[in-house]
């Protein structure tokens, strides 16, 4: 079943840089995606989130699998070159966690890097995972265009991770040089759409809140996503299954720092993907051990 | 609009050290990388490598390994550009352009003078 | 690396009439994608570069169209229909298929 923690997420503030821990399992779909690209001299590695949606299958945003050695067009990461590790709660201890190389990376075939929409992406791992307390799929919404409703708060894990200078091994076993050891979690109000759209017509740039992306936040700041925290789900609790459904995926924000006034984070509407996720897939809804809420 | 605005002129000595930054807006600035581009007087342009701005890896043309290094201050969405020991071979005009590969906008330039 | 030749060195040209530069690379610029990472660049006298084409033959927008790129492999082609005086600069090409990315040494495009 899908987006059943073990444990019950509580309801408490908290900010995903420097704020307080998650306890082990409330996130059992989050996912650490580490790319580590040694297609081309030098190598070059970075870091992202993703969401679990069934033993084989991680939902992530585009531009965390795209290859920035090129800018001119959209070129995906070779599989090759791509590591999950799930039930992961502490970087510094990888004893429980779940590590998996990717068999597929599939982009949104849309994906715009001047604009971020279509920031979707999949990644289908080579072995199906084991799912557990620490291991569990998180749900996908229903088709609706409209997205989560204005004001309706949602939750985002992650780890912040960001900085480049280190190994895979040390990033996870030691995890000394990332951002945040254990994973972070904030709870983030829906921002009516117009409001996000103002927001950002209003700076000078090229910036574009789509149909495609909602946005979340506070007007005063304070409390937001970060580098780092890419791809990772915005997750809401559905009212009539009581199941957690990811309705967004961490996506893009600024110009300002993460966190200022009147800033909101950017978020992938993954409603409008529903179907292009099943079909990515390759199973009608309710075969796999993830599914959509009902 | 689209902009990358360079630091001012430099005039410094040999052996001493130069730090020249790159103000980028108007566009998500972990979507593309930053190129750095080096410019002699009355030459062409020589390409001296980019860094990623999402990872914040750099990479570097051989002939600028070793004395030169790439940063970010990615909140402040500002790329940097350093070169330790400075020679008088250093002197030019070094520009910064949005993009790895594809180095569509340029700043302005930044004049680096070594003299003693 | 790959070297990048550009012929000629300076280009005369009376307003309305066209021009040519052409661009040889010491290897084909095909990349294993699929793609030609063959881009054109215009320096004004005391400016900073601005790209004008890119993948071969993609306007940049609010480039003219009286500018096209044209070529494949190894030779390419930039072409003015008619040059106008704010046309006037240095013409670069470059390659950002082999690392590390090469530009060839400059056309200077003079008006008669």
């Known amino acids: 079943e899908c987006g059943q923690p073990s444990r019950s997420l509580p309801s408490l503030v908290k900010r995903i840089i420097g704020g307080r821990n998650a306890e082990p399992g409330l996130f059992p779909w989050q996912a650490l995606i580490v790319v580590e690209d040694t297609s081309r001299v030098p190598n070059d590695k970075w870091f992202g989130s993703g969401a679990l949606l069934s033993e084989s299958w991680i939902l992530t945003a585009a531009h965390v699998l795209r290859s920035q050695r090129r800018d001119t067009t959209v070129i995906p990461v070779s599989k090759e070159h791509v590591t999950v590790y799930l039930g992961l709660h502490d970087v510094r201890d990888k004893s429980g966690a779940v590590n998996s190389s990717a068999a597929r990376v599939v982009l949104h075939p849309d994906f715009n890097i001047q604009n971020y929409n279509h920031d979707i992406a999949l990644v289908q791992l080579q072995e199906p995972v084991p799912l557990g307390p620490h291991v569990m799929p998180v749900c996908l919404p229903r088709l609706e265009p409209e997205g989560p409703s204005p004001h309706m708060l949602g939750l985002v894990a992650g780890w912040g991770i960001s900085n480049p200078n280190v190994t895979v091994d040390e990033i996870i076993s030691s995890g000394t040089r990332t951002l945040s050891d254990v994973l972070q979690y904030v709870k983030l109000p829906v921002v009516p759409h117009a409001e996000c759209k103002t927001s950002y017509e209003s700076r000078s740039g090229n910036y574009s809140v789509t149909e495609n992306m909602f946005c979340a936040g506070y007007y005063e700041g304070g409390k937001d996503t970060c580098l780092g925290d890419s791809g990772g789900a915005f997750v809401i609790l559905d009212d009539l299954s009581q199941r957690w459904v990811v309705q967004g995926l961490v996506s893009w924000g600024g110009p300002e720092e993460c966190g200022s006034k009147q800033v909101y984070g950017v978020y992938t509407k993954v409603s409008n993907y529903v179907d292009w996720v099943w079909e990515q897939m390759g199973s009608p809804q309710g075969r796999a051990p993830g599914g959509t809420v009902s | 609009q689209i902009q990358l605005v360079q630091s001012g002129p430099e005039l410094k000595k040999p052996g001493e050290t130069v730090k020249i930054s790159c103000k980028a807006s108007g566009y998500i600035f972990t979507s593309y990388g930053m190129s750095w581009v080096r410019q002699a007087p009355g030459k062409g342009l020589k390409w001296m490598g980019w860094i990623n701005t999402y990872s914040g890896v750099p990479t570097y043309a051989d002939d600028f390994k070793g004395r030169f290094a790439f940063s970010l201050e990615t909140s402040a969405r500002t790329p940097y550009l350093q070169i330790n020991n400075l020679k008088n071979e250093d002197t030019a005009t070094y520009f910064c352009?949005?993009?790895?590969?594809?180095?569509?906008?340029w700043g302005q330039g930044t004049s680096v003078t070594v003299s003693s | 690396d790959v070297l990048m030749t550009q012929t000629p060195l300076t280009l005369s040209v009376t307003i309305g009439q066209p021009a040519s530069i052409s661009c040889k690379s010491s290897?084909?610029?095909?990349?294993?994608?699929?793609?030609?990472?063959l881009n054109w660049l215009l320096q004004r006298p005391g400016q900073s570069p601005k790209r004008l084409i890119y993948l071969v033959s993609k306007l940049d927008s609010g480039v003219p169209d009286r500018f096209t790129g044209s070529g494949s492999g190894t030779d390419f082609t930039l072409k003015i229909s008619r040059v106008e005086a704010e046309d006037l600069g240095v013409y670069y090409c470059?390659?950002?298929?082999?690392?590390?990315?090469?530009f060839g040494g400059g056309t200077k495009l003079e008006i008669k």
């Open positions: 470059w390659q950002g298929t082999h690392f590390p990315w090469t």
């Open positions: 290897q084909s610029l095909l990349d294993s994608d699929g793609k030609t990472y």
């Open positions: 352009a949005r993009g790895g590969e594809a180095m569509d906008y």
